[in-house]
Amino acid sequence: EVEKTACPSGKKAREIDESLIFYKKWELEACVDAALLATQMDRVNAIPFTYEQLDVLKHKLDELYPQGYPESVIQHLGYLFLKMSPEDIRKWNVTSLETLKALLEVNKGHEMSPQVATLIDRFVKGRGQLDKDTLDTLTAFYPGYLCSLSPEELSSVPPSSIWAVRPQDLDTCDPRQLDVLYPKARLAFQNMNGSEYFVKIQSFLGGAPTEDLKALSQQNVSMDLATFMKLRTDAVLPLTVAEVQKLLGPHVEGLKAEERHRPVRDWILRQRQDDLDTLGLGLQGGIPNGYLVLDLSMQEALS
């Protein structure tokens, strides 16, 4: 807590300018009017204040706005944002995307800090859903943002927002997250033609059910092995040899290199060996010819 001291004669700040960098902490506290600071926050960023001086300026704003800063101040916080705690930010009501962008810009190039996470959370909750423009902005600053959300949080993403998602935004998503995102993507891209649809939906296919994979095999998509390897194992297992062949097209030869890895390994174990042999890839481990295949799911349903 800075001790309350009177401002020396002639030092009272008339505006926020570079002369203030020569003020000691106690002088800033005594000579800068909080209301003036609030109206001229846009100037603070252009002045090379020390961290200690910024602490004083923050303190003045805290005193002026004990219930939380107004958006007009928040938008121009600049580097002062780095001084804010998550508790400070929880008091804010940020509704403007421009404000969000301005604050994210301050933190650009760094990991998502607790402050930024809190800011985003406040912003999204204020909007009620993660709309396209917001998602566009967030993924531009933090490509992994989408995958940092819980499946429950992702459920509030409207299908229209999916258009803003780039393949790299989904790199760190786990299957549970893709399970939520995939149906939204399918809805968002449903009116696109076959090849264009596949380009857009490809990154989301880790959440696709078997039926959709079978349907994709009808579209001449030639899925690459990297995409195939990210598919849900339980969705791949029921695919027939012919369906996998049609789904992968010329990339089917890549199955050989992946035969020891999931989901290819588990898929091979489900196929009849004579069906696998027809691929001519030397895949081994299928069900030997003449063996009976029991449908255990049917058995469980009956018991």
């Epitope: 039926e211 027939t240 996998v244």
Partner: antibody, heavy 117, light 107 residues
Framework: EVQLVESGGGLVQPGGSLRLSCAAS????????MSWVRQAPGKGLEWVAT????????YYPDSVKGRFTISRDNSKNTLYLQMNSLRAEDTAVYYC??????????WGQGTLVTVSS | DIQMTQSPSSLSASVGDRVTITCRAS??????LNWYQQKPGKAPKLLIY???RLHSGVPSRFSGSGSGTDFTLTISSLQPEDFATYYC?????????FGQGTKVEIK
């Protein structure tokens, strides 16, 4: 052993409707896409409709689009073809076939549909 | 739509003959070409899929070859039970289309 048995064929007037059924056995019905293929008397084969294993996706050629509807009931292992606004050129033997990726690998014995006044 | 054209439309041959039927696609269909056999009053049966792969239970005298647009079905030594009509079908692109058929008759 895969078995497909069609039923529901018969004589119908132009503009009329008919519903064909196909009872499947010998395989896990809900794992496979299913199709209908027809053959006009003395003519070749023509694909009519395909439905995905869960019934979400359906595919038709232009010749029947909007008039025919393929559906399935996986709990009954049964495939259906609802045919409306029938025309004389729809007269054919209708075959139910299992569809695997790009292959009609097993076929039923067929049911004859005659459209005539 | 992809048109499938078979030739000849019909042929007469004797038991033991080598028979060749060709199928041409109006555009590239990769190797997604299947052959079916149909006997009078019966349903078609799958013989060969993906150009050259024999369906289960099909005798090895049947073989297939080709790629892209031109395909061939060969019966190395015709047997009495092989007299039937043969159809090719492309499975590359919707709508799935069949050739008009080739009838193999006894000479």
């Amino acid at each position: 052993e895969v078995q497909l048995v069609e039923s529901g064929g018969g004589l119908v007037q132009p503009g009329g409707s008919l519903r064909l059924s196909c009872a499947a056995s010998g395989f896990t019905f809900s794992d496979y896409f299913m199709s209908w293929v027809r053959q006009a008397p003395g003519k070749g084969l023509e694909w009519v409709a395909t439905i995905s294993n869960g019934g979400t996706y359906t595919y038709y050629p232009d010749s029947v689009k909007g008039r025919f509807t393929i559906s399935r009931d996986n709990s009954k292992n049964t495939l259906y073809l609802q045919m409306n606004s029938l025309r004389a050129e729809d007269t054919a033997v209708y075959y139910c076939a299992r569809f695997d990726g790009y292959i009609f690998d097993y076929w039923g014995q067929g049911t004859l549909v005659t459209v005539s006044s | 739509d992809i048109q499938m054209t078979q030739s000849p439309s019909s042929l007469s041959a004797s038991v033991g003959d080598r028979v060749t039927i060709t199928c041409r696609a109006s555009q590239d269909i990769s190797n997604y070409l299947n052959w079916y056999q149909q006997k009078p009053g019966k349903a078609p049966k799958l013989l060969i899929y993906y150009t050259s792969r024999l369906h289960s239970g099909v005798p090895s005298r049947f073989s297939g070859s080709g790629s892209g647009t031109d395909f061939t079905l060969t019966i190395s030594s015709l047997q009495p039970e092989d007299f039937a009509t043969y159809y090719c079908q492309q499975g590359n692109t919707l709508p799935w289309t069949f050739g008009q058929g080739t009838k193999v008759e006894i000479k």
